[in-house]
Interface confidence: low
Amino acid sequence: SAPFSFLSNVKYNFMRIIKYEFILNDALNQSIIRANDQYLTAAALHNLDEAVKFDMGAYKSSKDDAKITVILRISKTQLYVTAQDEDQPVLLKEMPEIPKTITGSETNLLFFWETHGTKNYFTSVAHPNLFIATKQDYWVCLAGGPPSITDFQILENQA
């Protein structure tokens, strides 16, 4: 699915980091882990030290959107979660610093963060119908829903 063109003129300004060093577990209690330099995957871990720790940065939209817009960075790195297309793996993009302003095609770095009870959803700003998802026998990717798993639990203070 192509990015929504009407979003291209919306500007997102970085505010602050709102969460540090949290773990994402999917509905099967699988944690997101590093697969390699580029991709993430999910695995059932006995030792959460293996799980990726994320930082979450908040952005404010120029159109005063009610949704919370965030960027996801692997803690203690300069790697940022970047959306591709539907059913494609999310990539880890290296950037020297957290972007101060994001607009246009760079919105593939941003996600709308929604919470429903203990369930957390991350919708791609570039592809508003697609979520960060885990999928059996695959990488962490963008998906519209089942059979991919789109809801996550945030585990904090795991240090």
Epitope: I33, A43, A44, L45, Q136, D137, Y138
Partner: antibody
Framework: QVQLVESGGGVVQPGRSLRLSCTAS????????VHWVRQAPGKGLEWVAA????????YYAESVKGRFTISRDNSKNILFLQMDSLRLEDTAVYYC???????????????WGQGTLVTVSS | DIQMTQSPSSVSASVGDRVTITCRAS??????LAWYQQKPGKAPKLLIY???NLETGVPSRFSGSGSGSDFTLTISSLQPEDFATYYC?????????FGGGTKVEIK
């Protein structure tokens, strides 16, 4: 040096079971995902199954799903393949092979055993 | 599942020849492709991983290229010990799969 030694092959009748073992040495077994790959006589390579470094994630080819079970004992450095409901087409040399350290991902297989022959025959 | 198709299935060549083997994936696999060499009665040997990276100890006459769904293994100058069967393998999906193999024979 890295060594993988398969055992447990033999002749078995269709419908029966067989358990293959692969004993690892020369590396920290518990850090690596490991795989079974088979090769029917005169045919190409067919990936069969894989298990993650800690045994928590298992993956199977469609052709063996529900019949074969991969497992590992990290305390003894052994990989297993339990083969049930064997069919004539399961006749092959079975190799164990090592993937990459500490991740549950597909990987090129840099180290292989010498293989063990399983013959399913009535 | 991802299907891997190799061509040709066999090739006859002489020592010193340049040999090219192709591998096509049924869907895009980025650069997640490995090449193996297998001699009769022996286990496969990893030659190239991630499409173009030469495994340690493999002679530089072997090279790999390609990305997406089309890949190539090239032997720049065939040596007597290179007569063998070559397999590609995708390492993109958790369910690994191999190509059908290409037998390099003496002309």
């Amino acid at each position: 040096q890295v060594q993988l030694v398969e055992s447990g092959g033999g002749v078995v009748q269709p419908g029966r079971s067989l358990r293959l073992s692969c004993t690892a040495s020369g590396f920290t077994f518990s850090m690596f995902g490991v795989h079974w790959v088979r090769q029917a006589p005169g045919k190409g390579l067919e990936w069969v199954a894989a298990v993650s470094y800690d045994g928590s994630n298992k993956y199977y080819a469609e052709s063996v799903k529900g019949r074969f079970t991969i497992s590992r004992d990290n305390s003894k450095n052994i990989l297993f393949l339990q083969m049930d409901s064997l069919r004539l087409e399961d006749t092959a040399v079975y190799y164990c092979a090592r993937g990459r350290p500490k991740v549950v991902i597909p990987a090129p297989l840099a180290h292989w055993g010498q293989g063990t022959l399983v013959t399913v025959s009535s | 599942d991802i299907q891997m198709t190799q061509s040709p299935s066999s090739v006859s060549a002489s020592v010193g020849d340049r040999v090219t083997i192709t591998c096509r994936a049924s869907q895009g696999i980025s650069s997640w492709l490995a090449w193996y060499q297998q001699k009769p009665g022996k286990a496969p040997k990893l030659l190239i991983y991630e499409a173009s990276n030469l495994e340690t100890g493999v002679p530089s006459r072997f090279s790999g290229s390609g990305s997406g769904s089309d890949f190539t293994l090239t032997i720049s100058s065939l040596q007597p010990e290179d007569f063998a069967t070559y397999y590609c393998q995708q390492t993109s999906s958790f369910l690994l799969s191999f190509g059908g193999g290409t037998k390099v024979e003496i002309k």
